[in-house]
């Protein structure tokens, strides 16, 4: 069982390989000096049907380096960064893992592209392994919370409340969604 030629890459090179390309072979992509690699650099020859070989993912791309590009802090609810730190320049990558009791959907790594957006795939999502969710928390007068546009929330996540200037937060600032589907505290209030 073998794979066909690896997908080509513009403005870059593919690591050395011999043919036929055996299942288990890894090929690696790199870009010319003025270009930045966007996407996973390593492709693996696998077989899904024990008959034909196929590459396990699409090839990355080489983008012309844009020194003005910068990407915003990527947020994955229920997840955390295991690699990557601000500032995020063109070609920088961030890798995520999920918190305990969350499982990942999608690709764990994303790259800062020339268009100031993370890619080439969407940010991963971390899905709660618990079926229970906490109901949406109410807004508070003269205050805000971090999940204004989110409905129900998965266990393990938290909501942070804050007050407008001139108001004092009374109660818990951070409320956690418990595995029971209940919140760890009642919402606080904002008092003058």
């Amino acid at each position: 069982i073998s794979c066909g030629s690896p997908p080509p890459i513009l403005n870059g090179r593919i690591s050395y390989y011999s043919t036929p390309i055996a299942v288990g072979t890894v090929i690696r992509y790199s870009c010319s000096g003025t270009f930045r690699l966007i996407g996973e650099k390593s492709l693996l020859c696998i077989t899904k049907d024990k008959v034909d070989g196929t590459w396990d993912k699409p090839a990355p791309k080489c983008e012309y380096f844009n020194k003005y590009s910068s990407c915003p802090e990527p947020i994955v609810p229920g997840g955390y960064k295991i690699r990557g730190s601000t500032p995020y320049r063109h070609g920088d990558s961030v890798t995520f893992a999920c918190k305990t009791n969350f499982s990942m959907n999608g690709n764990k790594s994303v790259w800062c592209q020339a268009n100031n957006m993370w890619g080439p795939t969407r940010l991963p999502t971390c899905v709660s392994v618990f079926p229970l969710e906490c109901p949406a928390l109410p807004m508070i007068h003269n205050g805000h919370h971090t999940s204004e546009n989110v409905g129900s929330i998965a266990p393990g996540l938290s909501v942070t409340y804050s007050c407008e200037s001139g108001y004092l937060l009374v109660g818990e600032k951070i409320i956690n969604c418990l595995s029971s589907g209940k919140w760890s505290a009642v919402p606080p209030t904002c008092e003058e």
């Epitope: 690591s15 050395y16 390989y17 288990g24 890894v26 690696r28 696998i46």
Partner: antibody, heavy 119, light 106 residues
Framework: QVQLVQSGAEVKKPGSSVKVSCKAS????????ISWVRQAPGQGLEWMGR????????NYAQKFQGRVTITADKSTSTAYMELSSLRSEDTAVYYC????????????WGQGTLVTVSS | EIVMTQSPATLSVSPGERATLSCRAG??????LAWYQQKPGQAPRLLIY???TRATGIPARFSGSGSGTEFTLTISSLQSEDFAVYYC????????FGQGTKLEIK
């Protein structure tokens, strides 16, 4: 960090086989590849082969092709290396080493297993 | 197999001084090179990967450079714990190691 714990030292007769185990703890066994690297006394490091446990795919260095078999048991997070038709030149410390995904470099190593081949 | 050649075989340097170790690949390997440190009776330890990226927990005095066929590991100010054997390893095409450089106290 992933810990790799290998089986104990072995003394073998020429012509026989040896099977060394490498148990991983921490991390996800299915998300990495395990290589076997050996080091003869006072010598350098020599790559023998590697397995990607989630796929069950093993590949071998040409020098060891037909004489080495690398397997993995996902249920126990353990990789195995069996070397057959042993000769005195196979006396070495055998290491298992882990590469995250298919990065190509080894973040974690087992403590090594000394295999002595002697009549 | 890509042949990796390290030089010198033995390097004698005084503590506090700078050490420069070389590794040459038999063919172009881009930046697919790692450096390891090995002390007697121990397994190797990853220092540098992708030719110049320090592994987690490795002190800043260790730095790697080079691409293509010529690579260098530099230890800026040698500490007593740095005297060991150093290996380079390529992962452009499967895997192979250099024969090692022994760094000893002068």
């Amino acid at each position: 960090q992933v810990q790799l714990v290998q089986s104990g030292a072995e003394v073998k007769k020429p012509g026989s086989s040896v099977k060394v185990s490498c148990k991983a703890s921490g991390g996800t066994f299915s998300s990495y590849a395990i290589s076997w690297v050996r080091q003869a006394p006072g010598q350098g490091l020599e790559w023998m082969g590697r397995i990607i446990p989630i796929l069950g795919i093993a590949n071998y260095a040409q020098k060891f092709q037909g004489r080495v078999t690398i397997t993995a048991d996902k249920s126990t997070s353990t990789a195995y290396m069996e070397l057959s038709s042993l000769r005195s030149e196979d006396t070495a410390v055998y290491y298992c080493a882990r590469e995250e995904d298919i990065s190509g470099y080894y973040q974690d190593w087992g403590q090594g297993t000394l295999v002595t081949v002697s009549s | 197999e890509i042949v990796m050649t390290q030089s010198p075989a033995t390097l004698s340097v005084s503590p506090g001084e700078r050490a420069t170790l070389s590794c040459r690949a038999g063919q172009k390997i881009s930046s697919y090179l790692a450096w390891y440190q090995q002390k007697p009776g121990q397994a190797p330890r990853l220092l540098i990967y992708d030719a110049s990226t320090r592994a987690t927990g490795i002190p800043a005095r260790f730095s790697g450079s080079g691409s293509g066929t010529e690579f260098t590991l530099t230890i800026s100010s040698l500490q007593s714990e740095d005297f060991a054997v150093y290996y380079c390893q390529q992962y452009e095409y499967w895997y192979s190691f250099g024969q090692g450089t022994k760094l000893e106290i002068k």
